[in-house]
């Protein structure tokens, strides 16, 4: 014979558990109905009456089937550096995420507790690792032959233009200046110029060539004495 369907509240069989969307009430010692998301238990069950549920009030919510006496308070309004990606409803909490140009420096279960502006790389430095929702930008010095003349959270180091004749050699924060009307060529468009190890560089064994005397320009200088390199042009 099929087992009879018990209606809440009911006393469970010894050693068995209550069914899905039910809970065991210790006081009544009965299996009782849970309240649906968006509701809470207004009156707990007894041996003869089931749980009485009521809708959550404004600015409160329950996300799961529950038997809590009060709904949870929605989080405070999103701060000026955040955007509300999920509104506070009776069934879900408000979720705040960082606005564009910011990242989450301190996260919480859902959304972000503390946003911080993405680091901007200063001239002479390029973005080596872009920012994400939860991590900051990492800046690295531009390698010889590349430069960045901006303060930006997105700009990478770009190659110096290559000149027939160099008027001013490029350095880490400035492009080369050519004497002719146009450079002979530049690095191929779309090439990635994130700062990276340069296998031909010898800085592990001897002093580094200065960014101001970057090979991409200085080797194309006309014959004769080369112009003095700028001193200490680290960036």
């Amino acid at each position: 014979l099929p087992a009879q369907v018990a209606f809440t509240p009911y006393a469970p069989e010894p050693g068995s558990t209550c069914r899905l969307r039910e809970y065991y009430d210790q006081t009544a010692q009965m299996c009782c109905s849970k309240c649906s998301p968006g509701q809470h238990a207004k009156v707990f069950c007894t041996k003869t009456s089931d749980t009485v549920c009521d809708s959550c009030e404004d600015s409160t919510y329950t996300q799961l089937w529950n038997w809590v006496p009060e709904c949870l308070s929605c989080g405070s309004r999103c701060s000026s550096d955040q955007v509300e990606t999920q509104a506070c409803t009776r069934e879900q909490n408000r979720i705040c995420t960082c606005r564009p140009g910011w990242y989450c420096a301190l996260s919480k279960q859902e959304g972000c507790r503390l946003c911080a502006p993405l680091r901007k790389c200063r001239p002479g430095f390029g973005v080596a690792r872009p920012g994400t929702e939860t991590s900051d930008v990492v800046c690295k010095p531009c390698a010889p032959g590349t430069f960045s003349n901006t303060t930006s959270s997105t700009d990478i180091c770009r190659p110096h233009q290559i000149c027939n004749v160099v008027a001013i050699p490029g350095n880490a924060s400035m492009d080369a200046v050519c004497t002719s009307t146009s450079p002979t060529r530049s690095m191929a468009p779309g090439a990635v110029h994130l700062p990276q190890p340069v296998s031909t560089r010898s800085q592990h064994t001897q002093p580094t060539p200065e960014p101001s005397t970057a090979p991409s320009t200085s080797f194309l200088l006309p014959m004769g004495p080369s112009p003095p390199a700028e001193g200490s042009t680290g960036d």
């Epitope: 680091r119 790389c121 200063r122 430095f125 010095p141 190890p197 800085q203 002093p207 001193g231 680290g234």
Partner: antibody, heavy 119, light 106 residues
Framework: QVQLVQSGAEVKKPGASVKVSCKAS????????IHWVRQAPGQGLEWMGW????????DYADKFKKRVTMTADTSISTAFMELSRLRSDDTAVYYC????????????WGQGTLVTVSS | DIQMTQSPSSLSASVGDRVTITCQGS??????LAWFQQKPGKAPKLLIY???SLQTGVPSRFSGSRSGTDFTLTISSLQPEDFATYFC????????FGGGTKLELK
Amino acid sequence: QVQLVQSGAEVKKPGASVKVSCKASGYTFTDYIIHWVRQAPGQGLEWMGWIDPDYGNTDYADKFKKRVTMTADTSISTAFMELSRLRSDDTAVYYCARDEGSPLVMDAWGQGTLVTVSS
Amino acid sequence: DIQMTQSPSSLSASVGDRVTITCQGSQNIDNYLAWFQQKPGKAPKLLIYSTYSLQTGVPSRFSGSRSGTDFTLTISSLQPEDFATYFCFQYNNGYMFGGGTKLELK
């Protein structure tokens, strides 16, 4: 919290070399470059150079190019500055400082290492 | 090299005084100028970066400003703990410290 801890004081003879260490903690070592700055007794601050621990790239002030070598060991989050052919006027406190490459510069410093060059 | 000329080299003042220290760059350095405070036997401490930005934890009596290639550090009302040596530092094109200003109690 962010800390840069430098090695202890050194006494060296002219012509010798010295290697100063700077151990970083409290942040991702490879995300910042390390500068070295020195200060002779009663004098101002003098920038010597930087190293990017991630790639080993360096840049040295012209004055020190022929005598300084900056290295880093990422496995122990430590930067090193070696100065060779020491002279008496190299007697100074040597500092390391970190730099994130943004407009915020040298926001954390080591406590300094006194190097005395004397015969 | 870009040279940074800092003045005065020394300065006597009293608690509560308003003090200004200036740094002049030999070339344009945009806003890439920082100010450091150093006390005897201690490492320098960053006060202001990018000309105007106050480093976290630094009291608001410290401020920075600029007019062309002239940069100024102002302490609006000197406190006993402010007596120290101050250095400007340019980091736009290479790196260069100013000569320093020793701020002493009058």
